[in-house]
C-alpha cells in the first residue's frame, strides 16, 4: 500500500511508533523539528505498542492500512490485489479519515475511537487490539502529553515533507 | 507459518477442535486409533471453543501460531517477511513449548497456563480468552477425561503421522 504517496513523513512517524523503532522515530521527529515534550508524548504512545507485543503492532498497522486504503481515502475504486493498491488522494495531503482516526485515538473515548475503526469493517480482533492500545495511551498520557502530540501532528500535516 | 511441517496430525487435531469441526476431528482421531473415551475428552474441549464463539477460535489459533512460530520453536532466526517465515525445527517433532502449553492447558492451573501463554507477548485480550477456555475445560472435564486427553496426545506425538 503506497500510503507514503500522500504524506510520507506521517507514515514514517506512524510506522516508527507502531514498530517500536526508537531510532527511526527520533530521526523522523528531527525532520519536523519536534520539541522535547512532543518527543516524550510520541514515545509514550510507542511504549504502548511495545508493551502489547508484536501482534498488537501488526494489527494496528492493519487498522492504518485499512483506513488509508478505504473508499474514504481513495480517489477511485481500488483493485483487489495488494500490489495494485494505490492511494489516489487529492495531492499529497493526508486523508481526512486518517486525521479523524488519529484525533480520536488521542482525544476521543475508547468507544468513539473503536467505533470509528469499526466503520472500516475491521476484524473483531483488530477492534479489541485498537481498544487496548487506546486504553494504554489514555493511562500513559497526561492531557499535556496529548496536546503535545496534537501540536506535533500539526507540524507533520503542514510540513513540506507531507 | 508452516506449522504442519513439524507434526501435521497434531495441528490437524488442534484446528479441528478449535474450529468446532466435528467431522474433521473424527477423521483425524481415527488416524491415530483414538479410543471412545479419548474422543469424548477431545469433544469436551471442542465444546468449549464452540460455546465461546468465533472470536475465541481466532484468538486461540493466534496463541498456537504465536507459540509455534516463536524463538522457542524455531531452529533459526526468522526473516522479517511473513512469506519467509518457516518452522525449522529438528525433524518433524512437535516443539517442546507447544507440548508444555497443551500440557498446562490440561493439567495446570488457569494462572499457570495463562502465564505461559503470556511469555509469548500475547495481547491481553488473547490472554483473557485463553483463561476463559481453560476455565471451561476445567469445569467440563473430569480427571479421567484429562488423562484420556493426555494419552491421546501421547498417541499423536508418537504417531508416524507426526
Amino acid at each position: 500500500v503506497k500510503m507514503a504517496e500522500t504524506c510520507p513523513i506521517f507514515y514514517d512517524v506512524f510506522f516508527a511508533v507502531a514498530n517500536g523503532n526508537e531510532l527511526l522515530l527520533d530521526l523522523s521527529l528531527t525532520k519536523v523539528n519536534a520539541t522535547e515534550p512532543e518527543r516524550t508524548a510520541m514515545k509514550k504512545i510507542q511504549d504502548c505498542y511495545v508493551e502489547n507485543g508484536l501482534i498488537s503492532r501488526v494489527l494496528d498497522g492493519l487498522v492504518m492500512t485499512t483506513i488509508s486504503s478505504s473508499k474514504d481515502c481513495m480517489g477511485e475504486a481500488v483493485q483487489n490485489t495488494v500490489e495494485d493498491l494505490k492511494l489516489n488522494t487529492l495531492g499529497r495531503e493526508i486523508c481526512p479519515a486518517v486525521k479523524r482516526g488519529v484525533d480520536l485515538f488521542l482525544t476521543g473515548t475508547p468507544d468513539e475511537y473503536v467505533e470509528q475503526v469499526a466503520q472500516y469493517k475491521a476484524l473483531p480482533v483488530v477492534l479489541e487490539n485498537a481498544r487496548i492500545l487506546k486504553n494504554c495511551v489514555d493511562a500513559k498520557m497526561t492531557e499535556e502529553d496529548k496536546e503535545n502530540a496534537l501540536s506535533l501532528l500539526d507540524k507533520i500535516y503542514t510540513s513540506p515533507l507531507c | 507459518v508452516k506449522m504442519a511441517e513439524t507434526c501435521p496430525i497434531f495441528y490437524d487435531v488442534f484446528f479441528a477442535v478449535a474450529n468446532g469441526n466435528e467431522l474433521l476431528l473424527d477423521l483425524s482421531l481415527t488416524k491415530v486409533n483414538a479410543t471412545e473415551p479419548e474422543r469424548t475428552a477431545m469433544k469436551k474441549i471442542q465444546d468449549c471453543y464452540v460455546e465461546n464463539g468465533l472470536i475465541s477460535r481466532v484468538l486461540d489459533g493466534l496463541v498456537m501460531t504465536t507459540i509455534s512460530s516463536s524463538k522457542d520453536c524455531m531452529g533459526e532466526a526468522v526473516q522479517n517477511t511473513v512469506e519467509d517465515l518457516k518452522l525449522n525445527t529438528l525433524g518433524r517433532e512437535i516443539c517442546p513449548a507447544v507440548k508444555r502449553g497443551v500440557d498446562l492447558f490440561l493439567t495446570g492451573t488457569p494462572d499457570e497456563y495463562v502465564e505461559q501463554v503470556a511469555q509469548y507477548k500475547a495481547l491481553p485480550v488473547v490472554l483473557e480468552n485463553a483463561r476463559i477456555l481453560k476455565n471451561c475445560v476445567d469445569a467440563k472435564m473430569t480427571e479421567e477425561d484429562k488423562e484420556n486427553a493426555l494419552s491421546l496426545l501421547d498417541k499423536i506425538y508418537t504417531s508416524p503421522l507426526c
Epitope: 502489547n52 486504553n135 | 491481553p124
Partner: antibody, heavy 123, light 107 residues
Framework: QVVLVESGGGVVQPGRSLRLSCAAS????????MHWVRQAPGKGLEWVAV????????YYADSVKGRFTISRDNSNNTIYLQMNSLRAEDTAVYYC????????????????WGQGTLVTVSS | DIQMTQSPSTLSASVGDRVTITCRAS??????LAWYQQKPGKAPKLLIF???GLESGVPFRFSGSGSGTEFTLTISSLQPDDFATYYC?????????FGQGTKVEIK
Amino acid sequence: QVVLVESGGGVVQPGRSLRLSCAASGFTFSSYGMHWVRQAPGKGLEWVAVIWYDGSIKYYADSVKGRFTISRDNSNNTIYLQMNSLRAEDTAVYYCARALIPVAGTDPIFGYWGQGTLVTVSS
Amino acid sequence: DIQMTQSPSTLSASVGDRVTITCRASQSVSSWLAWYQQKPGKAPKLLIFKTSGLESGVPFRFSGSGSGTEFTLTISSLQPDDFATYYCQQYNTYSPTFGQGTKVEIK
C-alpha cells in the same frame, strides 16, 4: 494459592495521612497489575488505583487523584497505598486486588481479593 | 465516568428459582463487563468476565449475557450458597466502575 493480606488500616483524623500495605503470595507477583478497591460501610464498591506489573504506570480514580499514591516493591511482593489529606468520605474497607491476567495493559478485572483493612477518618 | 445501574436493588427468591439481574451502562462498554458476588463481611469474588466467561471454580448455573449497554447475570437454579450481593463492573476504560449492587435474599 493466591493470598493477599492488607494491613495498616485504623482510625485517623481528617487531613492526616495513612499508609496501607498489601503482602502477596502464591503467584508470580512481578507479572501482574495490582489494584486498590474500597467499600464504604454499607455501600458499593469503588475502584481507587492501579499499578502495572513493573510499576511503570499508575492510574487513579478522580476522587483520590493528587492525594493518594500507589507503589509496589516487586522484591518483597508488596504494594502500598499512601493516603494523604484524608477526608471523612475516605472511610471504607480498602481491598487489595490482583489483576486477573498478567503483563502490561491488562484490563482491570479483579481476579483475587484480600480480606480488606478498615480505614476510619473521624475527628 | 461510565455509570452502571443495576436492577433490581433487592430480589427475594427461593431455592431452585431462576434469577436474573440486569446491569445497564450509561454508554457502550462493548463486552467488557464482569460480575462479582459478595457475602457479608467477606471480599467480593469474581464470577464472570468479558460478559460471559465463567471464572475458574464458578458453577455452570451462573451465566452472563449482553453487549453494549445492557447485560444480565442469570442463576439458573438458585442454591442456598447463592444468597449474597452481586455487582456488575465495566472495564471499558482504565477507570472501571461498579453497579450499586443487587442483594439476593431468601423469600
